[in-house]
Interface confidence: low
């Protein structure tokens, strides 16, 4: 089938001791090969500081996956989610302030 770019959604969840978990979700993309990773100050975080979900079918002929990492509260602006899919790439910031969701569809 033709290439379908992912919808990328970055969310935050508060956890204890001043840390938050930031999760980057990519959904509704085809084909299934995708790079999704967290960067701090533009530098990719190491594998053992991130957690990934499998790339799974979402029931519509497209795929979904996610990557998460824990960061210190207040340092959100230093982190971005990097996505590369079928030759296209983009970076997605962690939402600031009270906004805990950020959506962006790649074209």
């Amino acid at each position: 089938g033709s290439t379908v770019p992912p919808m990328v959604n970055v969310t935050c969840s508060e956890v204890s001791e001043g840390n938050i978990t930031v999760t980057c979700r990519a959904s509704s993309f085809y084909p299934r090969n995708i790079t999704l990773t967290w960067r701090q100050d533009g530098v990719s975080l190491s594998h053992n500081t991130q957690q990934w979900g499998d790339v799974l079918p979402d029931g519509n002929g497209t795929y979904q996956t996610w990557v998460a990492t824990r960061i210190r509260q207040g340092e959100e602006q230093r982190f971005t989610c990097y996505m590369e899919h079928s030759g296209n790439h983009g970076t997605h910031p962690v939402p600031s302030g009270n906004s805990h969701h950020h959506h962006h569809h790649h074209h």
């Epitope: 995708i34 999704l36 701090q40 530098v43 990719s44 190491s46």
Partner: antibody, heavy 120, light 107 residues
Framework: QVQLKESGPGLVAPSQSLSITCTVS????????VNWVRQPPGKGLEWLGM???????DYNSALKSRLSISKDNSKSQIFLKMNSLQTDDTARYYC??????????????WGAGTTVTVSS | DIQMTQTTSSLSASLGDRVTISCSAS??????LNWYQQKPDGTVKLLIY???SLHSGVPSRFSGSGSGTDYSLTISNLEPEDIATYYC?????????FGGGTKVEIK
């Protein structure tokens, strides 16, 4: 074009230390991890360790006490240092880029390797 | 460490033959298995990642399969340039470990 090239001393005396440099081009060390793998003559491949984009390192526990991996992002160079070499450290030493997404992790581009002989 | 075993250290086949190379792990590795080709001059190339995904630029005559502890690499139509040693490698747990290799020669 992604390329990696190892350069080493060729010959090292027993009990001395080994330093090898891997110079890369075509990609940034801040965004990719680089692995070190060696192959003794006539034998298989052995993973030594790696350095991630953020500078974190992982080592093969069997060699951890003798190994150190570092890098200079601005010069696109990775450095392997191994102490207390013995004759069974004689091998071809490779650097290889580590690519990963999701739960897939693989060494997608390898250098040609540099041969190190430990002998007096 | 997880031990990877390639029971056949060398094999001879005719051009055009279908060649299968097997690899077994000392414990389940959840398809976290790659295959590499090493030419006689020492050049190493990635062929297959995550059990069955063909790396870009690799001919389609190469394929991978398996699950649990048992995996295989198949060359469907052996060509002269396939003369090499083939290594499986697991990355289920650090350290990544390689099989002992299978050398493929022409009859």
């Amino acid at each position: 074009q992604v390329q990696l090239k190892e350069s080493g001393p060729g010959l090292v005396a027993p009990s001395q230390s080994l330093s090898i440099t891997c110079t890369v081009s075509g990609f940034s060390l801040t965004g990719s991890g680089v692995n070190w793998v060696r192959q003794p003559p006539g034998k298989g491949l052995e993973w030594l360790g790696m350095i991630w984009g953020d500078g974190n390192t992982d080592y093969n526990s069997a060699l951890k006490s003798r190994l150190s991996i570092s890098k200079d992002n601005s010069k696109s160079q990775i450095f392997l240092k191994m102490n207390s070499l013995q004759t069974d450290d004689t091998a071809r030493y490779y650097c290889a880029r580590g690519a990963y997404y999701g739960k897939r992790w693989y060494f997608d581009v390898w250098g040609a390797g540099t041969t190190v002989t430990v002998s007096s | 460490d997880i031990q990877m075993t390639q029971t056949t250290s060398s094999l001879s086949a005719s051009l055009g033959d279908r060649v299968t190379i097997s690899c077994s792990a000392s414990q389940g590795i959840s398809n976290y298995l790659n295959w590499y080709q090493q030419k006689p001059d020492g050049t190493v190339k990635l062929l297959i990642y995550y059990t069955s995904s063909l790396h870009s630029g690799v001919p389609s005559r190469f394929s991978g399969s398996g699950s649990g502890t048992d995996y295989s690499l198949t060359i469907s139509n052996l060509e002269p340039e396939d003369i090499a040693t083939y290594y499986c490698q697991q990355y289920s747990k650090l350290p990544p470990t390689f099989g002992g290799g299978t050398k493929v020669e022409i009859k």
